[in-house]
């Protein structure tokens, strides 16, 4: 194994779970996967004297890297103190150190709610010269928060002087006011309240609504899939118009593009509807450099009896990226369906939401047909997620049992697609270079996460991971609500102690 | 090593039974599919069935020329495999393998018994 | 049943010497096809799977290509030990079948 340096992660406890009275603590500075050995461990107690005690590296199974803890038990007026753990380690470099300064314990919190209100606009619709937004961050514990305002994503240069804080109770309010011009408003760009808070980030976004449509009539325009994107590289947008009754004006839909460049030839499409109504379709081919570098393109319907054109644009989604992570199940025999079993990859903690999932069997790409995939929906943080499941003959997986989920997305590097291999008989599928399995171990902390059901093998544990109080077979003291895991993770021991 | 030897073949009249085994050792028997292919001298390899593993209710196949005659069973417990074969003809007469399929590719076979002689004559 | 046609039904070749022998399909099996080597007097040999993965063991001189209903087996630089009957397995379903066989005779 070549030279890894240590990844570090505090261990301390919640503070509810320590007695008002404890006249001593323990805490704890977890060093994983360096290799190789030794790692130097110090501590700096500041006025306060303390013992410590090193334990025996341990090896990860897999890796063959190594993983110890060093505990510090400390006396006295410790509640205030900040502690320091400072890790060397002398085969990455005779200067590779890191430090992590923490308190004796985690505190429960209330996270804040975020919402942005939007001044009125005049009676007659109309905006008025400036625009404010409020943003109220709203039923936290209180603490310190930062607030900041995005443009498109981009920080904005704002007064936050006049933000103001109150306390009801035991929770607090702040609330942050931002003013633009009318033109700024109007350019269609979106506004975010960014809130930072324990080390956690809270958000609302808003922009102006789409003018209100001529009644009963949509239009829609899609991005180009990341499929069509990064593998066939001939991506195309659409322009959906539903709803329109059929007459003997003809619905125009006129492409462009912001930068005024010309666009390429567009195909349309005219359906009629069960239900008597005309949907109209215009499919533009784009440039994968165009759409990539952000070239905004625009879609305007026009009908002799609409009252206004309606004008519909779409570009790259601005924001940050996050590459998917894939994880790939087989669902275990049922009774009466012995010949068919359940493939399920979940694909999670994406963004920007655009993502295109595919099926593959012994390399080639089962049809579009064969499986069936949610829509990206919001995690609890801030990336999506998808599920798609896919059912397969006994004749298939006995051709050969192993079946490729396949994420596109841009986040994904080096070539825009992650995949995961599942086999219906796992235990029998007898490895294979493709799997990108890590099974390793996964290190937990009690506290929130205490009494969750296990991690399902194959997915990320975090953050449903088990943890008991304390295990026999980890050699730390009990009170530290240390466990360790096998699970199947993206990578060796992960830290998943949210107190 | 993966090992596998047949035994139990012999010279039968025609409308006989005749029970094969095949005894295998270095891999783990449970595991695997297993099947019998057959070769009549100077002829080609005729599959002839194949018995799943626990895991998939060791269940079996046969080609059309020897459903309802010959039956595949397995002893998990002792790593054997054995052909049970019925109403034998003359054309049945060829030497029988024991073959291990693979894994993942459950249809594909890798490694072979040195084969057992059987001659179906009155 | 999927047919398996092989081709040439027998060659001779001379040591050092390359030979390719086809198998052909009567459906599109799309990769699942295996080649196995049997000496004079031995049982089967695994040379390839699912196509062009040379199984354990096999000399890299073997080498196999194909998809669809096309199949062939190039072996390089012809040994001596690689003279007897090469046979093609489809492992796409059930039944499995096998080819009629190549004789592969030093010349």
């Known amino acids: 194994a070549s030279t890894q340096s240590p990844s570090v992660f505090p261990l301390t406890r919640c503070c509810k779970n320590i007695p008002s009275n404890a006249t001593s603590v323990t805490l704890g500075c977890l060093a994983t996967g360096y290799f190789p050995e030794p790692v130097m461990v110090t501590w700096d107690t500041g006025s306060l004297n303390g013992t410590t005690m090193t334990l025996p590296a341990t090896t990860l199974t897999l890796s063959g890297h190594y993983a110890t803890i060093s505990l510090l038990t400390v006396s006295g007026a410790w509640a205030k103190q900040m502690f320091t753990c400072r890790v060397a380690h002398t085969p990455s470099s005779t200067d590779w150190v890191d430090n992590k300064t923490f308190s004796v314990c985690s505190r429960d919190f209330t996270p804040p709610t975020v919402k942005i209100l939007q001044s009125s606009c005049d009676g007659g619709g109309h905006f008025p010269p400036t625009i404010q937004l409020l943003c109220l961050v709203s039923g936290y514990t209180p603490g310190t928060i930062n607030i900041t305002w995005l443009e498109d994503g981009q920080v904005m240069d704002v007064d936050l002087s006049t933000a103001s804080t109150t306390q009801e109770g035991e929770l607090a309010s702040t609330q942050s006011e931002l003013t633009l011009s009318q033109k700024h408003w109007l350019s269609d760009r979106t506004y975010t309240c960014q809130v930072t808070y324990q080390g956690h980030t809270f958000e609302d976004s808003t922009k102006k609504c789409a003018d209100s449509n001529p009644r009963g009539v949509s239009a829609y325009l899609s991005r180009p899939s990341p499929f069509d994107l990064f593998i066939r590289k001939s991506p195309t947008i659409t322009c959906l118009v539903v709803d329109l009754a059929p007459s003997k004006g003809t619905v125009n839909l006129t492409w462009s593009r912001a930068s005024g460049k010309p666009v390429n030839h567009s195909t349309r499409k005219e359906e009629k509807q069960r239900n008597g109504t005309l949907t109209v379709t215009s499919t533009l081919p784009v440039g994968t450099r165009d759409w990539i570098e952000g070239e905004t393109y625009q879609c305007r319907v026009t009908h002799p009896h609409l009252p206004r054109a309606l004008m519909r644009s779409t570009t790259k989604t601005s924001g940050p990226r996050a590459a998917p992570e894939v994880y790939a199940f087989a669902t275990p025999e049922w009774p009466g369906s012995r010949d068919k079993r359940t493939l399920a990859c979940l694909i999670q903690n994406f963004m920007p939401e655009d993502i295109s999932v595919q099926w593959l069997h012994n390399e080639v790409q089962l049809p579009d047909a064969r499986h069936s995939t949610t829509q990206p929906r919001k995690t609890k943080g801030s990336g999506f997620f998808v599920f798609s499941r896919l059912e397969v003959t006994r004749a298939e997986w006995e051709q050969k049992d192993e079946f490729i989920c396949r994420a596109v997305h841009e986040a994904a590097s080096p070539s825009q697609t992650v995949q995961r291999a599942v086999s219906v008989n796992p235990g029998l599928a007898g490895g294979s270079a493709q799997s990108q399995r890590a099974p390793d171990r996964v290190l937990c902390h009690s506290g929130q996460q205490q009494g969750l059901p296990r991690a399902a093998g194959g997915s990320v544990p975090h953050p449903r991971c088990h943890c008991g109080a304390g295990r026999a077979d980890w050699p730390g003291p009990p009170e530290l609500d240390v466990c360790v895991e096998e699970a199947e993770g993206e990578a060796p021991w992960t830290w998943t102690g949210l107190c | 090593e993966v090992k596998l030897v047949e035994s139990g073949g012999e010279l039968v009249q025609p409308g006989e039974s005749l029970r094969l085994s095949c005894s295998t050792s270095g891999f783990t028997f449970t595991d695997y599919y297993m099947s019998w292919v057959r070769q009549p001298p100077g002829k080609a390899l005729e599959w002839l069935g194949f018995?799943?593993?626990?895991?998939?209710?060791?269940?079996?196949e046969y080609s059309t020329s020897v459903k309802g005659r010959f039956y595949i069973s397995r002893d998990d417990s002792q790593n054997i495999l054995y052909l049970q074969m019925n109403t034998l003809r003359p054309e049945d007469g060829a030497t029988y393998y024991c073959?291990?399929?693979?894994?993942?590719?459950?249809?594909?076979?890798?490694?072979w018994g040195q084969g057992t002689s059987v001659t179906v004559s009155s | 049943d999927i047919q398996l046609t092989q081709s040439p039904a027998s060659l001779s070749a001379s040591v050092g010497e390359t030979v390719t022998i086809t198998c052909r399909t009567s459906e599109n099996i799309y990769s699942y096809l295996a080649w196995f080597q049997q000496r004079q007097g031995k049982s089967p040999h695994l040379l390839v799977y699912?196509?062009?993965i040379l199984a354990e063991g096999v000399s890299s001189r073997f080498s196999g290509s194909g998809s669809g209903t096309q199949f062939s087996l190039e072996i390089n630089s012809l040994q001596p030990e690689d003279f007897g009957t090469y046979y093609c397995?489809?492992?796409?379903?059930?039944?499995?079948?096998f080819g009629a066989g190549t004789k592969l005779e030093l010349k």
């Open positions: 699912d196509s062009k």
């Open positions: 073959v291990r399929n693979k894994k993942v590719y459950y249809y594909a076979v890798d490694y």
């Open positions: 018995i799943r593993n626990k895991a998939n209710s060791y269940t079996t």
């Open positions: 397995q489809h492992h796409y379903g059930i039944p499995l079948t």
